[in-house]
């Protein structure tokens, strides 16, 4: 099956202090390789979450990524701050035998728009 990375929401709005879910699904787990979430693009992009076991404060996976045939790579960001605003991308990599993993597909991005906390 052809690999497609889908981020169904173009944008989400969230009040400062609240949490938000960023959705991402894949049509195939092949080729073998990790899925990572980034904010921004190019050289200035920031790694937000990797489904490879590291700990990321305030960011958790929504479903159990270790389950066989799980295609849901959505994440939850807790206690959102204005600094979390930006466009988030769910990116699929292909594992390299010795060289670094190769980025092969990305979702279209989801903008996180942070609203002032209601007083």
């Amino acid at each position: 099956k052809e690999l497609k990375v889908t981020q169904p929401e173009k944008s989400v709005s969230v009040a400062a202090g609240d949490s938000t879910v960023l959705n991402c699904t894949l049509t195939s787990l092949l080729p073998v390789g990790p899925i990572k979430w980034y904010r921004g693009v190019g050289q200035s992009r920031l790694l937000i979450y990797s489904f490879t076991g590291e700990h990321f404060p305030r960011v958790t996976n929504v479903s159990d990524a270790t389950k066989r045939n799980n295609m849901d790579f959505s994440i939850r960001i807790s206690n959102v701050t204005p600094e979390d605003a930006g466009t988030y991308y769910c990116v699929k990599f292909q594992k390299g035998p010795s060289e670094p993993d190769t980025e092969i597909q990305s979702g279209g991005g989801t903008e996180v728009y942070v609203l002032a906390k209601p007083s």
Epitope: K10, S11, S13, V41, G42, S106, G108, E111, L115
Partner: antibody, heavy 119, light 108 residues
Framework: DVQLVESGGGVVRPGESLRLSCAAS????????MNWVRQAPGEGLEWVSL????????YYADSVKGRFTISRDNSKNTLYLQMNSLRAEDTAVYYC????????????WGLGTLVTVSS | ETVLTQSPGTLSLSPGERATLNCRAS??????LAWYQEKPGQAPRLLIY???SRATGIPDRFSGSGSGTEFTLTISSLESEDFAVYYC??????????FGGGTKVEIK
């Protein structure tokens, strides 16, 4: 049929204000994000601003930030662009554009309205 | 922001000829790229989205290809109504949404 009709353009002096309107029909206006895109004489297209269907999410190009305000009235199926502190470089045809529901490209455009800023 | 560079600036061709328009992105936009046609006095028209998908009602002489940073719009056999200005637009890296500078297809 989708129709977008811009109005409100005209000739103004630098520093003055103008309010553009875009009357939409043929689709469920409140369900779609809307944009303003402009084209200076002899130049290419430049994205100006976008507003989400609910009006909660708003973005501006750096060139107009702090001077232009986008808004919408979903009960009137109308998009607005309030332009303050106008400059000669704001002279352009201003187009109203309806976004696709999945991604940020434009599936329908209006004919545009000409704004001329001149002393 | 992602800069889009279109080439050539002007393409002089005769009806019936094949037109090849290029759009290069300063960084990868995968296939998140659209093409528009603009004619004087008319609303811009969406031709292609997702780099290669034809919009509703667009004749099959228009086709798009490419991914990453290199994209092409091909008009297989030019008809009189195809002489216009064409723009590419990326919607991956945003905001801002960015357009290329345009390619004018004129009658030779």
């Amino acid at each position: 049929d989708v129709q977008l009709v811009e109005s409100g353009g005209g000739v103004v002096r630098p520093g003055e204000s103008l309010r553009l309107s875009c009357a939409a029909s043929g689709f469920t206006f409140s369900s779609y994000d809307m944009n303003w895109v402009r084209q200076a004489p002899g130049e290419g297209l430049e994205w100006v601003s976008l507003i989400s269907g609910s009006g909660e999410i708003i973005y501006y190009a750096d060139s107009v930030k702090g001077r232009f305000t986008i808004s919408r009235d979903n009960s009137k199926n109308t998009l607005y662009l309030q332009m303050n502190s106008l400059r000669a470089e704001d002279t352009a045809v201003y187009y109203c554009a309806k976004e696709n529901n999945r991604y940020r490209f434009f599936d329908y455009w209006g004919l545009g309205t000409l704004v001329t800023v001149s002393s | 922001e992602t800069v889009l560079t279109q080439s050539p600036g002007t393409l002089s061709l005769s009806p019936g000829e094949r037109a090849t328009l290029n759009c290069r992105a300063s960084q990868s936009v995968y296939t998140y790229l659209a093409w528009y046609q603009e004619k004087p006095g008319q609303a811009p028209r969406l031709l292609i989205y997702d780099a290669s998908s034809r919009a509703t009602g667009i004749p099959d002489r228009f086709s798009g290809s490419g991914s990453g940073t290199e994209f092409t719009l091909t008009i297989s056999s030019l008809e009189s109504e195809d002489f216009a200005v064409y723009y590419c637009q990326q919607y991956y890296d945003r905001p801002p949404l960015t357009f290329g500078g345009g390619t004018k297809v004129e009658i030779k």
